[in-house]
Amino acid sequence: VGSGMGTGQRAGSPAAGPPLQPREPLSYSRLQRKSLAVDFVVPSLFRVYARDLLLPPSSSELKAGRPEARGSLALDCAPLLRLLGPAPGVSWTAGSPAPAEARTLSRVLKGGSVRKLRRAKQLVLELGEEAILEGCVGPPGEAAVGLLQFNLSELFSWWIRQGEGRLRIRLMPEKKASEVGREGRLSAAIRASQPRLLFQIFGTGHSSLESPTNMPSPSPDYFTWNLTWIMKDSFPFLSHRSRYGLECSFDFPCELEYSPPLHDLRNQSWSWRRIPSEEASQMDLLDGPGAERSKEMPRGSFLLLNTSADSKHTILSPWMRSSSEHCTLAVSVHRHLQPSGRYIAQLLPHNEAAREILLMPTPGKHGWTVLQGRIGRPDNPFRVALEYISSGNRSLSAVDFFALKNCSEGTSPGSKMALQSSFTCWNGTVLQLGQACDFHQDCAQGEDESQMCRKLPVGFYCNFEDGFCGWTQGTLSPHTPQWQVRTLKDARFQDHQDHALLLSTTDVPASESATVTSATFPAPIKSSPCELRMSWLIRGVLRGNVSLVLVENKTGKEQGRMVWHVAAYEGLSLWQWMVLPLLDVSDRFWLQMVAWWGQGSRAIVAFDNISISLDCYLTISGEDKILQNTAPKSRN
């Protein structure tokens, strides 16, 4: 992987390979090799927040009671085994479905070492045929498994507790001299196997990344909590080429798919074949006008299709993304062959109907024509299919390059890694992390609202039972109305005997206001599904309004914006529950409750059960948040 950038964890090559074939260049450029990799980058902020929110300083708890951290990198075996073809001793074929997800068997290979990661700042796991056999097939006679895993527990545990910077893990095809296209095909199989990084941090009592359903329920005093993260591509099938465009001239293997498959010794001669131009010259395959014969051939290789009857053959691009209206398909075809067939291009967007692309031919050099078709900027990832529809007895098609050009503008339109988080209840029920510590019991025994929540930093989880939990008021004169923490002692509030943050807006001759300010919260992780939850109540008549203001500390300047507001309220005396999405918060922030009222007001304003979702700091959405549907969600 070159120049000390990473630490290679080679995962095997078989001694005997297939018969000798043309070798692909050993000097795949750095960019090309990088483009074959799947990169996992866990931001350093995640480590900081996981440490601050979940891992108490080591001295504060006994070693036995400290939370544990585990990690692994998992891949589905089926696509990897399909690549290897049928192997002796495999008890389920590569084409058949893997064992059911709930009880997926897995075999664990050794991951990288902390020492190497510390030295190289990145862990590189190279996956080859040998590792696939070892991880997915195992010794003869043993059942094949559905999941191949690399154990990264030591590494993750070190990084989360003592590491610095971000955690970079690169998974790539093992580099070795082999038959043409091997690395590209292996890279495609690795992507198809949906590689995902799994992390787990759990309090005492839980011991595995496996499904927790097959573990005994620990008693509440023994077990605290169990959080799991999965980092995976939000579009696992999206080609790395999206980042650089796709240009395939068939001189080297590319990530295109062919139907019928690319010709090899086993399949019939009327499928696509990659042939060097010299061979085509000797075979007199492309006999254009005599004057052009000598110079007609492109250098290098191209695709040839020799069909014997009416049929349809397809070349399919990898999954791509476009961020430019000028994204265009360009395909070079031999124009003297066109009368015997025609080319059709189709845009195949994910989750949408296909549509035909208007192809405009531009005559090129030496008998070749470039067909260009505008793709534009589809909303979803897409593939492009080029179909050759032959007609008549004998039909020839030759393609010299297949490119998707001008598809990115500015930042890379490549796929985004999502870090999905979950909380596992004692009985095995899995919740989204945002459901933990939100004052609603979702686990049967309520452990999603227990010990872990109460240990969060001040202000994150507040029911005012222990005072103001970080909420403060400015210096107050004795006559100014004050926010107080007390119970609503009234027959009408028997269902709510606990403490709340209250303000009495008793009748005043002039208008009054009162402000209370929260503790400061760190900046949420970019594109996290961050939310603020709280319950509120207004009892009586409010002649005025109450606002919740979010104040960001932007490079020393304070910027406030109102995120919630209620005005001139005839109180229903009902507690209402509210969820506010906190979008576009990029700096540390605090909250302010501001109440203003005038003559005739006789109301009690109350807030309770305020929480900042753990998602703000421990979850990363695959896509950047779009500002839509951001109205607060409310319920009684």
């Epitope: 845009l347 109907a353 549509r355 531009t362 260009q372 505008r374 534009g376 900027r377």
Partner: antibody, heavy 121, light 107 residues
Framework: QVQLQQSGAELVRPGASVTLSCKAS????????MHWVKQTPVHGLEWIGA????????AYNQKFKAKAILTADRSSSTAYMELRSLTSEDSAVYYC??????????????WGQGTSVTVSS | DIQMTQTTSSLSASLGDRVTISCSAS??????LNWYQQKPDGTVKLLIY???SLHSGVPSRFSGSGSGTDYSLTISNLEPEDIATYYC?????????FGGGTKLEIK
């Protein structure tokens, strides 16, 4: 603002050829495809074909492949359509239209005022 | 080729009415449909692209909907300047094809 100015009405003899022009202004000519549409009372609107002024590449409705030739002159931001071997069937109003891609959806977002062609002896 | 059919060739409505013009395709076109307005003087304008997206500058009283083979254009509150012929056009498969048009008149 975007404008497509088409040449004036034509009266031509059967068997002759005619070239219609469409001068574009108010946008970068090479950034958008130019399409041509035929309108008759009998067949309504029919798509003839398109040209990409950037590359000079053109594509045709099979029905008009032998009838129309599309070209573009980048220096004058003008698109042309030559109609050959004219018959009375070719009497129609011909529109040039700029095509824009909204996301990946092509739509003819600006139209010329149309050129009336009458084929008569 | 895909045939586009606008069954109603002409339609009379009163000012302020809600008017719906329909268009059907001979096969599924996956929302790949545009609507155009042609005024009596021959001027043509794009109204709606991709079934339901309003082209810039088009009044919000125009809306489009549909899926599969059946699509419609709705004018929610008919104004005098809406007197025109309306065409649908598919771009799912080449060649692009248009409906026969629906002429809208005032009662």
């Amino acid at each position: 603002q975007v404008q497509l100015q088409q040449s004036g009405a034509e009266l031509v003899r059967p068997g002759a050829s005619v070239t219609l022009s469409c001068k574009a202004s108010g946008y970068t000519f090479t950034d958008y495809e130019m399409h041509w549409v035929k309108q008759t009372p009998v067949h309504g609107l029919e798509w003839i074909g398109a040209i990409d002024p950037e590359t000079g590449g053109s594509a045709y409705n099979q029905k008009f492949k032998a009838k129309a030739i599309l070209t573009a002159d980048r220096s004058s931001s003008t698109a042309y359509m030559e109609l050959r071997s004219l018959t009375s069937e070719d009497s129609a109003v011909y529109y040039c239209t700029r095509t824009r891609y909204y996301g990946s959806s092509p739509a003819m977002d600006y139209w010329g005022q149309g050129t009336s062609v009458t084929v008569s002896s | 080729d895909i045939q586009m059919t606008q069954t109603t060739s002409s339609l009379s409505a009163s000012l302020g009415d809600r008017v719906t013009i329909s268009c059907s395709a001979s096969q599924g076109i996956g929302n790949y449909l545009n609507w155009y307005q042609q005024k009596p003087d021959g001027t043509v304008k794009l109204l709606i692209y991709y079934t339901s997206s309003l082209h810039s500058g088009v009044p919000s009283r125009f809306s489009g909907s549909g899926s599969g083979t059946d699509y419609s254009l709705t004018i929610s509150n008919l104004e005098p300047e809406d007197i025109a012929t309306y065409y649908c056009q598919q771009y799912s498969k080449l060649p692009y094809t248009f409906g026969g048009g629906t002429k809208l008149e005032i009662k």
